[in-house]
């Protein structure tokens, strides 16, 4: 089970993302924000330091809108 805040790397990170995001899929990196101008990756955010469920969910792909 996923704990509130922990370090996730490699296959464990992928498995957790697949569980959290489900059919939506996920991204390893997000586009840079206007503030930082740098892309951020889930590897850096969750493998190199602890991350929580809310942060994991921000890497889920947005589901396509149904007609």
């Amino acid at each position: 089970a996923y704990r509130p805040s922990e370090t996730l790397c490699g296959g464990e990170l992928v498995d957790t993302l697949q569980f959290v995001c489900g059919d939506r899929g996920f991204y390893f990196s997000r586009p840079a924000s206007r503030v930082s101008r740098r892309s951020r990756g889930i590897v850096e955010e969750c493998c190199f330091r602890s991350c929580d469920l809310a942060l994991l969910e921000t890497y889920c792909a947005t589901p396509a809108k149904s007609e």
Epitope: T7, L8, C9, G10, G11, S39, E44, C47, F48, R49
Partner: antibody
């Protein structure tokens, strides 16, 4: 237990491209993060970059324009290419692995490949 | 100039306790990124000594311990032994550089 072995030319001419390969044994290349680090003679460690087999990469900003990392899952190998080399690129080059059991720490290293840039 | 600052050298007599510090900033250690420590003997590859600030991989003696506070981290070695003479490097991730960073290394001499 994962083991790594670097291979490639020990001598590269200035302005040419340095190419190294790291062969992985005892583990699947699709399970971990892979990294390259170098160490110039008598100096400290310098991170070159790392990547995940899915295509996610991150390179040292100071080397980014010259670095390419790739993976060959069929051979269980990953490689480093560094273009337009100069004498400053002379170093021992290490491949390393983040298995994920060590919170992002590089827990498996190759023995290192000495590369000299000289004409 | 390394992003993570380490003293170039430190020394101690056998049996003593020595501490090696690694000073970072708010974009690396202070941002919550884990610190790892490596031990390197001349002519050999570095070996992971401490991971995730304070954890020891299997096989590393409990004489080695790590800690982190604020923007700094420390490696402590108790009961110093002659075979501990080596170079020690800290490593973390830096969000402003978008990459991993190493300290400049500390050479430990056992007197």
């Amino acid at each position: 237990q994962v083991q790594l072995q670097e291979s490639g030319p020990g001598l590269v001419k200035p302005s040419e491209t340095l190419s190294l390969t790291c062969t992985v044994s005892g583990g699947s290349i699709s399970s971990y993060y892979w990294s390259w680090i170098r160490q110039p003679p008598g100096r400290g460690l310098e991170w070159i970059g790392y990547f995940f087999y899915s295509g996610y990469t991150n390179y040292n900003p100071s080397l980014k324009s010259r670095v390419t990392m790739s993976v060959d899952t069929s051979k269980n190998q990953f490689s480093l290419k560094l273009s337009s080399v100069t004498a400053a690129d002379t170093a021992v080059y290490y491949c390393a692995c983040i298995t994920g059991t060590t919170k992002g720490g590089m827990d498996v290293w190759g023995q290192g490949a000495t590369v000299t840039v000289s004409s | 100039q390394s992003v993570l600052t380490q003293a170039p050298s430190v020394s101690g007599a056998p049996g003593q306790r020595v501490t090696i510090s690694c000073t970072g900033r708010s974009s690396n250690i202070g941002a919550g990124y884990d610190v790892h420590w490596y031990q390197q003997f001349p002519g050999t590859a570095p070996k992971l000594l401490i991971y995730g600030n304070s954890n020891r991989p299997s096989g590393v003696p409990d004489r080695f311990s790590g800690s982190k506070s604020g923007t700094s981290a420390s490696l402590a070695i108790t009961g110093l032994q002659a075979e501990d003479e080596a170079d020690y490097y800290c490593q973390s991730y830096d969000s402003s550089l978008s990459g991993s960073v190493f300290g400049g290394g500390t050479k430990l001499t056992v007197l």
